[in-house]
């Protein structure tokens, strides 16, 4: 993702509560940083349908975060 000026998060608003698993191409997690003070879960959709932000408080987001953290650490 390109860098934005300090204090600007990539996601706007609270995000969707869930995305159909079959529609997910990739999930990216952006951890709090100088650019944004909150965790952001960004879903890339299949068939070039763009990206959506997942509400980080949602059940699906928590599952994705756990899965990614297990894989990375």
């Amino acid at each position: 993702f390109p860098m934005f000026k300090r204090g600007r998060c990539l996601c706007i608003g609270p995000g969707v509560k869930a995305v159909k698993v079959a529609d997910i191409e990739k999930a990216s997690i952006m951890y709090p940083s100088n650019n944004c003070d909150k965790i952001e879960v960004i879903i890339t959709l299949k068939e070039n349908k763009g990206q959506r932000c997942l509400n980080p408080k949602s059940k699906q987001a928590r599952l994705i975060i756990k899965k990614v953290e297990r894989k990375n650490f």
Partner: nanobody, 126 residues
Framework: EVQLVESGGGLVQAGGSLRLSCAAS????????IGWFRQAPGKEREGISL????????YYADSVKGRFTISSDNAKNTVYLQMNSLKPEDTAVYYC???????????????????WGQGTQVTVSS
């Protein structure tokens, strides 16, 4: 059923003001970002302003910055666009749209918005 209904358009002289309203039903504003777009004859739909009611963040296109102000009344489930110092080039049909899970990268991409109103005509005469 989700519905967005715009009102407040009309004919105004250059330099004048109008306030557009976007009444939402079937969902709460806190769950969505609400944007205003406009489309002039023969031109593409242009995103001009957006608000996220959950935290009150606002965004403006350069073409309206300093002249237009977006606000929301969560109790009325309504978003407003106060338009001041109107110019003839502001003449267009104005639409409000609702998006969930929007990214800053695709702020003004119409296809990223889930619901649209029917539009209200704004005409600015010189």
């Amino acid at each position: 059923e989700v519905q967005l209904v715009e009102s407040g358009g009309g004919l105004v002289q250059a330099g004048g003001s109008l306030r557009l309203s976007c009444a939402a039903s079937g969902f709460t504003l806190d769950d969505y970002a609400i944007g205003w777009f406009r489309q002039a004859p023969g031109k593409e739909r242009e995103g001009i302003s957006l608000i996220t009611s959950d935290d009150g963040s606002t965004y403006y296109a350069d073409s309206v910055k300093g002249r237009f102000t977006i606000s929301s009344d969560n109790a009325k489930n309504t978003v407003y666009l106060q338009m001041n110092s109107l110019k003839p080039e502001d003449t267009a049909v104005y639409y409000c749209a609702a998006a969930q899970g929007l990214l800053l990268l695709s702020l003004w991409v119409p296809t990223q918005y889930d619901y649209w109103g029917q539009g209200t005509q704004v005409t600015v005469s010189s």
